[in-house]
Each structure stands twice: as structure tokens, then as C-alpha cells.
Amino acid sequence: MAVTACQGLGFVVSLIGIAGIIAATCMDQWSTQDLYNNPVTAVFNYQGLWRSCVRESSGFTECRGYFTLLGLPAMLQAVRALMIVGIVLGAIGLLVSIFALKCIRIGSMEDSAKANMTLTSGIMFIVSGLCAIAGVSVFANMLVTNFWMSTANMYTGMGGMVQTVQTRYTFGAALFVGWVAGGLTLIGGVMMCIACRGLAPEETNYKAVSYHASGHSVAYKPGGFKASTGFGSNTKNKKIYDGGARTEDEVQSYPSKHDYV
């Protein structure tokens, strides 16, 4: 029950996180005009990964897309790539995790397969979250660097007569959305990995127990291994116990719900 809850919660948290990563990627407010010196501005600038916008006090807003690919800063391209990779991995992770959910029965899918899928989706969510956090952090670092550079030459003048005020940019709402969303996706991924361990506990190393029946000694080994007779190879009396449809050369064998000792 706890495993199902952990898996379900991990899925929901990751879903919210990935929705947040998508929202952050699409948002225009990655960087917003710094209003420290002028809290009421007549023209307000803000920028996203895909376009830059200007909002006037009149309410008129105009956005312009970055219609160039080669002319954009490499850092911006890197951030775009990280966010897209994060979304793609997250989306695949969500798709995989839907089929991995314990509460959803798909044919005769084994718990071992569900465990593997849960682990796969968990890893995908972790990488997705890390991509988003990395992307947002790279952009934030870029902003901090530019902020202090523009502060250093805030006013450039012609003989001190005419002042050109440089527009400084600070953290936009999308950065915080991205950080939180990335964190949630990461947490969701970790929860999925924890749930995977619960779905697939390591094999219990029981000692082989001998049941002495009249005539023949049958050694019974749990966990899907073939039991053999105690003495010689009397095939007539050989019992095969296989809890599932697994082969005997599997590295690790997981007991199914039918496996009882």
C-alpha cells in the first residue's frame, strides 16, 4: 500500500513539475526590467526564451519573437536546449510511469516489469528536473553578470550633458517557476525510484529446506528455481516450481504475489 502511495505521489509531483517546466519555458518573464530606481515606469520591458515584450502604462503590450537562430547568444540557446530536453525527458517519463503505476493493470504485466519501468521513469524525472534547474540557473547567472555589468556603466553620457539610462534586467517570474518545477520533478523522480525498490525488494536468501517424504527426498527452493531430488536425477519425481514465467538464469528473481513458502 505504501509503495502504491509513494509511486502515485511521485507520479503526481512529477506531473505538476513537468507542467511547471513547460509553463516556465513558454513564459515571457524570464528577465524583467529592474524597477529599483523607478518603481512606477511608463515603459516596462521583459524577456523570455522565445520573445521580448514591452508593456506601456497605457496597457499596450507589444511582443517581438527572436526570429534569428544564429544571432542569439550561445547561453540562451543552451538554456532553450536544456529546457526542451527536460520537457522531452519528462514527457517520456510520464508516459512510461503511467504504465508502471501499480494501481493500473495492463494485461499480465509482471511486477518486475513495473519495477523496471518505475525506475526508468524515476531516472527520467530526475534528469528532467536537473535539466530544468540547470537551464534556469544558467539564465540566472547570465542575468546577474549582465546586471552588474550594466550597473558599472549605468550612465553613459556625452560630456555629462546627455544621459543614456541603460535598462537593467532582474529575475523574472519564470525563473522561480522553473526552479520550483525542476525541484518538484526531481523529488517526484526520487519518489519513483524509492517506489521501485518497494515494488522489487531484493531476493530473500532462504536456506533450502528439506522436506523428508516417504521414499524420496525433495529439496524445495523458493523463488522460481527448479527443485531437484536429494539423490541422483530421478526425473519422475522432479518437481518444478516457478512462481512466474521467468527463466532460471535470471540474475535476480522477484517473488510474485503467488509465492508463498
Epitope: Q33, N38, V40, T41, A42, V43, N45, Y46, Q47, S52, C53, V54, E56, S57, S58, G59, F60, E62, R64, V162, Q163, T164, V165, Q166, T167
Partner: antibody
Framework: QIQLVQSGPELKKPGETVRISCKAS????????MQWVQKMPGKGLKWIGW????????NFAEDFKGRFAFSLETSARIAYLQISNIKNEDMATYFC???????????WGQGTSVTVSS | DIVMTQSPSSLTVTVGEKVTMSCKSS????????????LTWYQQKPGQPPKLLIY???TRESGVPDRFTGSGSETDFTLTISSLQAEDLAVYYC?????????FGGGTNLEIK
């Protein structure tokens, strides 16, 4: 069509309070800010300030902070300019103007003349 | 505050003549975000409220005759009337629309000979 109609001329004694109204029609009142401008006889235009008709937040030029106040009657689509403790130097024509694209004053009221006489 | 300086303060011209008036700002009115200059021109005829002529330094307001042209960038702006008409007798004001307070220039008074 968009129209801004201001109240009639005012004659006030120093120290009194005057309230000028500006009734808007032809557009959604809360979608555009309202600005106020002072025109003194023989002088140029002076920007008093503006009020965000949606958030009701005012913004004044430094020279007009204190005795000047903006208010709104949103349901009636009216903006008000109130000048308290009126002085001789407040004698002017006051215009209301809609805040338009490019932070301009795209539509103007006809103006309200305020005379201060003891 | 941004200081707007207009020149000349008064101009006497004849009908049909080309007229140019200047407006200078103490700070750049160019917004880097959209590469627009937030400079507005108004025309005020005697006994009337001002009328919007040009915004964003060069964009003509609808209904304004094409003889009115705005130009310039950052701190230096010009309003040109290609062929003056009698009805253009007025005071012309430039205004900073970039930063609060939205300051006006002193005006250029256009008189007909």
C-alpha cells in the same frame, strides 16, 4: 466615438477646495488610465499626473504632490481632480486626457477653467 | 526628471512654406526593448485642447495629414510640416512619453505672416 466631457468653469477663493470632473464615454473606462494636465495663462502644458482606472493607483509629478488628488467613480465612468487649499498660482485651465498607445494623450477633455480670486 | 527643450520658441512663416521645429531631451527616449523612441508631438490651437499628432517619434496618429512628419532618435527630434496651411497656426508641444513624470517641452508657437 470616444469623448471626455469636463465640468464647467470654477471660481474659487484662496484656501477653498475645487473638484473637477471628467466623464468618459465610447470606451471601457477601466482599460485606459486618465491623465491630468495644467495650462496656465501664457504658459506651456504641465503634466500633473495620472490614475490607473483599473487599480486606482495614482502617480503625480513632484510639483503636484500634496494638495492635488485623483479619484474615480467607476460605475459612472467619471474621473475627478481635486485641488485643496487652492492658491492663486493654481489659476489655470485643467485638462483630462486618456492614456493611449505610446503613453500618449490620445483623447482630451475640453478643459475646465479655474479662477482664484479673493 | 527628463527635461524637454524646444526650439525655436516662436516661428513666423508663410503658407506653403516648409517648417521644421526641434525638440531635445536630457535623456535618451529610446527604449531598448522595442527600439522605439517615446517622444510625442501635440498641436494646440487657440481656445482648444491639445491634439495628438505623432507618437513613437515618427508614427502619425490616424486622421493627421501626411504633411506632418516626425523624425529623430534618442535625444534629438524634429517635427516637419512639409507645406504649411493656414489651419496649422498653433502651438506645438513635444512630450517625453518614456519616463514619469511625462514632461512637456516649452512649445513652439507657429505664427502666419
Amino acid at each position: 466615438q470616444i469623448q471626455l466631457v469636463q465640468s464647467g468653469p470654477e471660481l474659487k477663493k484662496p484656501g477653498e477646495t475645487v473638484r473637477i470632473s471628467c466623464k468618459a464615454s465610447g470606451y471601457t473606462f477601466t482599460t485606459a488610465g486618465m491623465q491630468w494636465v495644467q495650462k496656465m495663462p501664457g504658459k506651456g502644458l504641465k503634466w500633473i499626473g495620472w490614475i490607473n482606472t483599473h487599480s486606482r493607483v495614482p502617480n503625480f509629478a513632484e510639483d503636484f504632490k500634496g494638495r492635488f488628488a485623483f479619484s474615480l467613480e467607476t460605475s459612472a465612468r467619471i474621473a475627478y481632480l481635486q485641488i485643496s487649499n487652492i492658491k492663486n498660482e493654481d489659476m489655470a485651465t485643467y485638462f483630462c486626457a486618456r492614456l493611449g498607445k505610446g503613453n500618449t494623450m490620445d483623447f482630451w477633455g475640453q478643459g475646465t477653467s479655474v479662477t482664484v480670486s479673493s | 526628471d527628463i527635461v524637454m527643450t524646444q526650439s525655436p520658441s516662436s516661428l513666423t512663416v508663410t503658407v506653403g512654406e516648409k517648417v521644421t521645429m526641434s525638440c531635445k531631451s536630457s535623456q535618451s527616449l529610446l527604449n531598448s526593448g522595442n527600439q522605439k523612441n517615446y517622444l510625442t508631438w501635440y498641436q494646440q490651437k487657440p481656445g482648444q485642447p491639445p491634439k495628438l499628432l505623432i507618437y513613437w517619434a515618427s508614427t502619425r496618429e490616424s486622421g493627421v495629414p501626411d504633411r506632418f512628419t516626425g523624425s529623430g532618435s534618442e535625444t534629438d527630434f524634429t517635427l516637419t510640416i512639409s507645406s504649411l496651411q493656414a489651419e496649422d497656426l498653433a502651438v506645438y508641444y513635444c512630450q517625453n512619453s518614456y519616463s514619469f513624470p511625462l514632461t512637456f517641452g516649452g512649445g513652439t508657437n507657429l505664427e502666419i505672416k
